[in-house]
């Protein structure tokens, strides 16, 4: 109720002779601060004096003085909250009741605390979980109702007297609620720990033994078994007998059932500790164990591997990998059930024994097409030789072999022919599915093994084909060697380098760009007349009469090709000049007379000069000299001169006769 002082502290504190005691304590006074404090040992209230009698262990007064003999007991509190006490060392006769007499200005209070001091260190207490099962982690707790700052202690765990390897966690509590030291040990017990003694040992700071507590572990576990077999190596031959015995070395609680397992599967009607196998077969080979159960669960023995030996069974071959690509590596594995394992193998390729191959595996580092076929094997062990199984097929894949491009046409091939080529090959695996031809067209097209080239070109030189399965193999290119008539035939002037003048030496060349076959003949022609059969046409001294249209022809066995007509032009000075007179060389006076200077010239005459019988040049320079009206005085011999870029030429004299008219005669 509200008229009480409020205290908090452990109800009883425990210690032993020579140790110390630390009393955690808090309080709240009814009014004001603490003015006086006395610690009694077994206080008794004296009704006569209305005071407490008893041994005063500690006393503090208003003036704060403490008797010198009270150093063993210390008040560590204050005037309003803390009432913590320490007794160091503590003695056996300190056992009993401690009385804390508190006085404030107006109020008084006696608070009692029990102190239990034993003669020797008291033992800690081990706490175990209600049930311990093998391999399940448990926490072992060792508790000691003691802790004091001035007296350090330690708790150590021992298993069968040997310190335990697991790390323990020690904790202390010095609070108003509780005072203790606790050690906790996490530990996974095994079935072998069953019945073993665990000790928690109390030691002082130097490790000196003070006291201990012990418990015996009760570890629940599945039955622990041992299996024995006759014969001891568990290796027998078909028809032999085998005995297996199951022994329980430990079980907690007691076992209830027994069974036998082979390769993890329970054997029916086998519920005793002995398993008898009579006249074993190879199928009875396997891993055997016995299983015994209790309330915790089933326990299994170690496995016994029973080997029933027999000769190899018919073998099979595994190929890694088929189909195989030529040049790759392949491994063959001979698989045959046998016990003991085969020690020797015989390999066969297409029924023929492979010499020097006696291992379980055959490795071929570089497969070739001839390696294809059926592979089989025979396995052998100490008990005999197996039978040859059906074998496995190795398929060796490779690009088409020996690809050739073959021209089907009769030779020679001529320009414009239709050429047929075939793409041939020797062998292929997988089969050829397509062909390719080179050169390609602009639009690659599907092609069979035959290529038809219509209207073959003169320059179609080489063709190659490829036969393709998963890979393409190219043949060497073949030359079509197309034959054609000479090409690009033309006339070329070799000399002179400049224009041709009459009298020059002239050479014309008949050129062509190519011809197949190369052997050719030449023909020169002018106006349909054959001039020569050489590649060159030569003129030692060209004359104007040689001018004209020339063609050359080049022919080979395929055909002949003509050049375009080439015009030969000869330049010469005016020649064959003559003066012609119109209307004639006799003209009547008063009429008109026209003299014309006729000539042959290349280039044409560009300039004319007229002369009279006195070789006097006349003031006329055109081709025609017109006299109108003509006079008798004009009678006489005339000549003309013609000029071109090459030179000059003159005509012979031509005489003009002008006669008198009848009128003139009549006048006379």
């Amino acid at each position: 109720d509200s008229s009480k002082w409020v205290f908090e502290h452990p109800e009883t504190l425990y210690a032993w002779e020579g140790a110390c005691v630390w009393i955690p304590c808090t309080y709240r006074a009814l009014d004001g601060d603490l003015e006086s404090f006395i610690l009694f040992h077994n206080p008794e209230y004296n009704k006569n004096t209305s005071k407490f009698d008893g041994t005063r262990l500690y006393e503090s007064t208003k003036d704060g003085k403490v008797p010198s003999e009270q150093k063993r007991v210390q008040f560590l509190g204050d005037k309003n909250k803390n009432c913590t006490l320490s007794i160091h060392p503590v003695h056996l006769n300190d056992s009993g009741q401690l009385g804390l007499r508190m006085e404030s200005k107006t109020e008084k209070w006696m608070e009692r605390i029990h102190l239990n001091v034993s003669e020797r260190p008291f033992p800690p207490h081990i706490q175990l979980p209600p049930e311990i099962q093998e391999s399940q982690e448990v926490t072992l707790t060792c508790l000691l109702n003691f802790s004091c700052y001035g007296y350090p202690i330690q708790l150590q765990w021992l298993l069968e007297g040997v310190p335990m390897r697991q790390a323990a966690v020690t904790s202390t509590s010095l609070t108003i609620k509780s005072v203790f030291t606790r050690s906790e040990l996490k530990f996974s017990p095994q079935w072998s720990h069953h019945g073993k003694i665990v000790t928690c040992q109390l030691q002082d700071a130097d490790g000196k033994f003070l006291s201990n507590d012990t418990v015996q572990l009760n570890v629940k576990h599945t039955p622990k078994l041992e299996i024995k077999v006759t014969p001891s190596d568990a290796i027998v031959r078909e028809g032999d007998s085998v005995t297996m015995t199951c022994e329980v070395s430990s079980s907690n609680p007691e076992y209830t059932t027994v069974s036998w397992l082979k390769d993890g599967t329970s054997l029916k009607k086998q519920n005793t500790f002995t398993l008898n196998l009579r006249e074993v077969t190879k199928d009875q080979s396997g891993k055997y164990c016995c299983q015994v159960s209790n309330d915790v669960g089933p326990g299994r023995s170690e496995e016994v591997f029973l080997q029933v030996q027999y000769a190899p069974e018919p073998s099979t071959v595994q190929i890694l990998h088929s189909p195989a690509v030529e040049g790759s590596q392949v491994e063959f594995l001979c698989m045959s059930l046998a016990n003991p394992l085969p020690t020797n193998y015989t390999w066969y390729h297409n029924g023929k024994e492979m010499q020097g191959r006696t291992e379980e595996k055959v490795h071929i580092p570089k497969i070739l097409p001839w390696h294809a076929g059926t592979y089989s094997c025979v396995a052998e062990n100490i008990l005999g030789t197996g039978q040859r199984g059906p074998g496995a097929e190795l398929d060796v894949q490779y690009p088409p072999k020996k690809v050739t491009t073959v021209i089907q046409n009769p030779m020679p091939i001529r320009e414009g022919d239709t050429v047929t080529l075939s793409c041939n090959y020797n062998s292929s695996n997988p089969s050829v599915t397509r062909y390719e031809w080179k050169p390609h067209g602009a639009w690659e097209e599907p092609s069979l093994g035959v290529l038809k080239i219509q209207n073959v070109g003169w320059d179609n030189t080489t063709i190659a084909c490829a036969a393709c399965n998963s890979w393409c193999s190219w043949a060497s290119p073949v030359a079509l060697n197309v034959q054609y008539a000479p090409r690009d035939v033309r006339v070329r002037k070799i000399k002179p380098l400049s224009e041709i003048h009459s009298g020059n030496s002239v050479s014309l060349q008949c050129d062509f760009s190519s011809s197949h076959p190369k052997e050719v003949q030449f023909f020169w022609e002018k106006n349909g007349r054959l001039l020569g059969k050489e590649s060159q046409l030569n003129f030692d001294s060209i004359s104007p009469e040689d001018a004209g249209s020339y063609s050359c022809w080049v022919n080979n066995s395929i055909g002949q090709t003509a050049s375009k007509a080439w015009t030969l032009e000869v330049l010469y000075a005016p020649r064959r000049l003559r003066v012609s007179m119109s209307p004639g060389d006799q003209v009547m006076e008063g009429k008109s007379a026209t003299l014309t200077c006729e000539s042959d010239a290349n280039p044409p005459v560009s300039h004319y000069t007229w002369f009279d019988w006195n070789n006097q040049s006349l003031p006329y320079h055109s081709q025609k000299l017109r006299l109108e009206p003509v006079k008798v005085q004009h009678s006489g011999a005339y000549w003309c001169q013609g000029t071109n870029s090459v030179g000059k030429g003159r005509s012979p004299l031509s005489t003009l006769t002008v006669y008198y008219s009848p009128e003139t005669i009549g006048r006379r």
Partner: antibody
Framework: EVQLVESGGGLVKPGGSLRLSCVAS????????MNWVRQAPGKGLEWVGR??????????DYAAPVKGRFTISRDDSKNTMYLQMNSLKTEDTGVYYC???????WGQGTTVTVSS | YVLTQPPSASGTPGQRVTISCSGS????????VYWYQQLPGTAPKLLIY???QRPSGVPDRFSGSKSGTSASLAISGLRSEDEADYYC???????????FGGGTKLTVL
Amino acid sequence: EVQLVESGGGLVKPGGSLRLSCVASGFTFSNAWMNWVRQAPGKGLEWVGRIKSKTDGGTADYAAPVKGRFTISRDDSKNTMYLQMNSLKTEDTGVYYCITGATDVWGQGTTVTVSS
Amino acid sequence: YVLTQPPSASGTPGQRVTISCSGSSSNIGSNYVYWYQQLPGTAPKLLIYRNNQRPSGVPDRFSGSKSGTSASLAISGLRSEDEADYYCAAWDDSLSGPVFGGGTKLTVL
């Protein structure tokens, strides 16, 4: 007479799709390898892709600029080749021609315009 | 473009003009060259196949040739109707498809 007629061109926005058709006549279509060629306005010719005949696998090959966006297919029963154009870009604009490699005959072309 | 052509060429009627086409060993060097003529507003038409072969109906004024990794198209006796774009083409082994030249615009003056 060998004849190829393209259709399906038109105006489409960037990122859009269009399907062109090429109907063939005058030759054995099922044996032919068919091609698409395009021509951007005022520019040269550019191969788009081709489809092989079914007997040669019927697979299609594409030029780098259209790979992954264009798909060529064929329906031999209809003598028709198709060009499915997805994720169209402005640079895909142009006239699209179909060509048969066997005879090197070109269609009259169909115009595709890709513009926003 | 994989194949290189001059962008333009010109000539007067009756003249001879040549258009070049340059490539590499993976196209022209090892495969046939084709030439196409594209008249304004029409589809390309085959002019020369297999380097120098003319399909029927193509005048002999058109001729093709190939040397090494280059090819050329020659047109002699030029006519006004020859005014068109000319393209060379060849199969390319490394690209596994046909490649074209950028085209040459021929103008008849």
